[in-house]
Amino acid sequence: PPRGRILGGREAEAHARPYMASVQLNGAHLCGGVLVAEQWVLSAAHCLEDAADGKVQVLLGAHSLSQPEPSKRLYDVLRAVPHPDSQPDTIDHDLLLLQLSEKATLGPAVRPLPWQRVDRDVAPGTLCDVAGWGIVNHAGRRPDSLQHVLLPVLDRATCNRRTHHDGAITERLMCAESNRRDSCKGDSGGPLVCGGVLEGVVTSGSRVCGNRKKPGIYTRVASYAAWIDSVLA
């Protein structure tokens, strides 16, 4: 099933997030992703766990998954590079870089997003945008068009409370509020954007969605700048 869900959000303005990617398996949306360079999309490592023999592709320039749009184009994947320390049973190091078969054709609806290189936490209370094509309610309705939600960043101490994520949130992870509005495992790999800068990637660990005591977990890209640079080089 698609790993994707924006709960309690609303439809995004069409093509206002030109960095947004749909990672697809056998022609169906699987995960979110974010264009970070002309030929590279950043996503979550767990997204490809079940991909095995399937065909992985990346859709760029899309708002609707099904409708024809002039900016839409599906790219084959030349190389998939999961973070070397990612493991199936943990949310740590949940990053994946996908090299497209060719450089993306850039334009108003397809453009890489600057990503944070300064390794410091986003200040709690900052409102950040998360977007995706995942299911939009607990009944499992899947949207055709891109959804988004603006969520406040939560401080790590709160997120690590015993009643919340009980110490699982390392310095390489960050949290955002999940009170009825949330990202969920289906939006894995999608971007958390704060003030026009990519700060986090939705992790794909399984957790309850929309419960304020189980905040959304995001991998901090700044903490992986050296790895990202080394792969893109």
Partner: antibody, heavy 122, light 107 residues
Framework: QVQLQQSGPELVKPGASVKISCKAS????????INWVKQRPGQGLEWIGW????????YYNEKFKGKATLTVDKSSSTAYMLLSSLPSEDSAVYFC???????????????WGQGTSVTVSS | DIQMTQSPASLSVSVGETVTITCRAS??????LAWYQQKQGKSPQLLVY???NLADGVPSRFSGSGSGTQYSLKINSLQSEDFGSYYC?????????FGGGTKLEIK
């Protein structure tokens, strides 16, 4: 068109509480954060906190925790701010303001209420 | 908390002149900055968002610029309706503090 209509001026005694309102119209109330801002006479602007009407989530300036309580009534598209244990220095104009969204992740206070004057005096 | 230092605190200028108001953040705010105009006895009005973008209906004589910690609002060819107070506000973290304001007066 978008409008935020605030309740009228209040004269309250020191130590008392006051609840002021901000009625929204012209947009989907539950989709936008509502902020509250304080302005003392002849002074600058001070952010108190926000509430997201869709979920009731709140976030406060540390300085106003315990002083201000933000709530909403979705059925009437109205946001409220309760100010408690008022000393004279809480005499000010209080504004509500909506966060508008721009692009993917920028925001700013795009619509403001006309302000509610609160005077604390015995 | 991030501090926003706005200067000058007041400015006396004539109609037709050009003025620049500056705002310095105590740390990088990544262009997460807005400018507002407030007339006496009225509520503030949004002029600029994301440091450089004019809000709907704002005349083109207004312009915002800057990045990192340094930002400015420029008003070309001042009109009589431009007099009042101006405030910057950051949105990088909480609380989203305002600058102290700049009072623009007619000379």
């Amino acid at each position: 068109q978008v409008q935020l209509q605030q309740s009228g001026p209040e004269l309250v005694k020191p130590g008392a509480s006051v609840k002021i309102s901000c009625k929204a119209s012209g947009y989907t109330f539950t989709d936008y954060y509502i902020n509250w801002v304080k302005q003392r006479p002849g002074q600058g602007l001070e952010w108190i906190g926000w509430i997201f009407p869709g979920s009731g989530s709140t976030y406060y300036n540390e300085k106003f925790k315990g002083k201000a309580t933000l709530t909403v009534d979705k059925s009437s598209s109205t946001a409220y701010m309760l100010l408690s244990s008022l000393p004279s220095e809480d005499s000010a104009v209080y504004f509500c303001a909506r966060y508008g969204y721009y692009g993917s992740s920028f925001y700013a206070m795009d619509y403001w209420g006309q302000g509610t004057s609160v005077t604390v005096s015995s | 908390d991030i501090q926003m230092t706005q200067s000058p605190a007041s400015l006396s200028v004539s109609v037709g002149e050009t003025v620049t108001i500056t705002c310095r953040a105590s740390e990088n705010i990544y262009s997460n900055l807005a400018w507002y105009q407030q007339k006496q006895g009225k509520s503030p009005q949004l002029l600029v968002y994301a440091a450089t973008n004019l809000a709907d209906g704002v005349p083109s004589r207004f312009s915002g610029s800057g990045s990192g910690t340094q930002y400015s609002l420029k008003i070309n060819s001042l009109q009589s309706e431009d007099f009042g107070s101006y405030y910057c506000q950051h949105f990088w973290g909480s609380p989203p503090t305002f600058g102290g304001g700049t009072k623009l007066e007619i000379k």
